[in-house]
């Protein structure tokens, strides 16, 4: 025998009460599949989270953050603090990027600046806290067009990089 | 030699969905971050999103965001786009870009610019 | 519009030297490289510059970009009929964290 809460579309419920009816989810609630016994609670986004998509009959709504913010974890489960480009957030607010480091977003943390000798290239930008250092070409890359690769002085003053 | 190849696209009704790919060559696709870039004609160049091949981070354009996913697969050396919830506004060539500045290696490939593209696939978004 | 401002159009004559600006923010061209892109006609488009003033490869010399505070510059010395092409800026934006173009400026070669 087939199940009679089988027939019951997304957006309803299967109600025991009423002999398996499918019935409507009541407002603020929802069902993103059919056959369901019970309908979900839709998140609420309050506080420092803010409503990207309603909440509708057959589908949850979906929250991101208020300006100055930015999502964490799947479907945007917590906001975390935005800080500025050469800077990543501490447990005492927002720091600027140590020498040699960078951070060219408003999250994560400050990196170290990349490390050109390691491809057996020179730099041909020096880094920044907003910036990673630029890599020039290898001697054996170099052709005519090519820029020239005069590795600069070094850096003088704490500097830093993005992304 | 960098070869990038999309495919996929073609004509949908809007609120419809699409999944344009990007196959890759001649470089090590599993190094380098990777964009998806769109034109609508007679426009300019819009980025569209941008996946990062260490950690997988994904970041969107805020026209497309919610609705577009990007993902890769450096296995097949494929790169994809998920379109759903079209609008007639997503009408546009789309292209896949390599970035330059191998990772990881390479900590940021901002300053290197896209420096491979394929040759676009027209997504027409039409009722 | 764009959040990188740039001029529709320019034009010179072949052998002219033409420059295109383009201008943004501190949270874009003031903090982070910008590329710049030359797109011919029914075609994709090619890196030009990198890191603000840095040709790669095969590039020819009468190319040359610039950047001061949050603008940068392309300047096309030289000019011939084959520059004729849509450029265009980008950058990295730290705070919509992604990238951003300009809208392109249109060369016509007289």
């Known amino acids: 025998l087939q199940d009679p809460c089988s027939n019951c579309p997304a957006g309803t419920f299967c109600d025991n009460n009423r002999n398996q009816i499918c019935s409507p989810c009541p407002p603020n609630s929802f069902s993103s599949a059919g056959g369901q016994r019970t309908c979900d609670i839709c998140r609420q986004c309050k506080g420092v989270f803010r409503t990207r998509k309603e909440c509708s009959s057959t589908s949850n709504a979906e929250c991101d953050c208020t300006p100055g913010f930015h999502c964490l974890g799947a479907g945007c489960s917590m906001c975390e603090q935005d800080c500025k480009q050469g800077q990543e957030l501490t447990k005492k607010g927002c720091k600027d990027c140590c020498f040699g480091t960078f951070n060219d977003q408003k999250r994560g943390i400050c990196r170290p600046w990349t490390n050109c000798s390691l491809d057996g290239k020179s730099v041909l930008v020096n880094g920044t806290k907003e910036r990673d250092v630029v890599c020039g070409p290898s001697p054996a890359d170099l052709s005519p067009g090519a820029s020239s690769v005069t590795p600069p002085a070094p850096a003088r003053e704490p500097g830093h990089s993005p992304q | 030699e960098v070869q990038l190849l999309e495919s996929g696209g073609g004509l949908v009704q809007p609120g419809g969905s699409l999944r344009l790919s990007c196959a890759a060559s001649?470089?090590?696709?599993?190094?380098?971050?990777m964009s998806w870039v769109r034109q609508a004609p007679g426009k300019g160049l819009e980025w569209v999103s941008v996946i990062y091949p260490d950690d997988g981070n994904t970041y969107y354009a805020d026209s497309v965001k919610g609705r577009f996913t990007i993902s890769r697969d450096n296995s097949k050396n494929t790169l994809y786009l998920q379109m759903n919830s079209l609008r007639a506004e997503d009408t546009a060539v789309y292209y896949c870009?390599?970035?330059?500045?191998?990772?990881?290696?390479?900590?940021?490939?901002?300053?290197?610019?896209?420096?491979?593209w394929g040759q676009g696939t027209l997504v027409t978004v039409s009722s | 519009q764009s959040v990188l401002t740039q001029p529709p159009s320019a034009s010179g004559t072949p052998g002219q030297r033409v420059t295109i600006s383009c201008s943004g923010s501190?949270?874009?061209?003031?903090?982070?490289?910008v590329t710049w892109y030359q797109q011919l006609p029914g075609t994709a488009p090619k890196l030009l510059i990198y890191a603000d003033s840095h040709r790669p490869s095969g590039v020819p010399d009468r190319f040359s970009g610039s950047k001061s505070g949050t603008s940068a510059s392309l300047a096309i010395s030289g000019l011939r009929s084959e520059d004729e092409a849509d450029y265009y800026c980008?950058?990295?934006?730290?705070?919509?964290?992604?990238?951003?173009f300009g809208g392109g400026t249109k060369l016509t070669v007289l």
């Open positions: 870009a390599k970035h330059g500045g191998q990772k990881p290696t390479t900590k940021s490939s901002s300053a290197y610019g896209m420096d491979g």
């Open positions: 001649g470089f090590t696709f599993s190094g380098y971050d």
């Open positions: 501190s949270s874009n061209i003031g903090n982070n490289y």
């Open positions: 980008a950058t990295w934006d730290y705070s919509l964290s992604g990238y951003v």
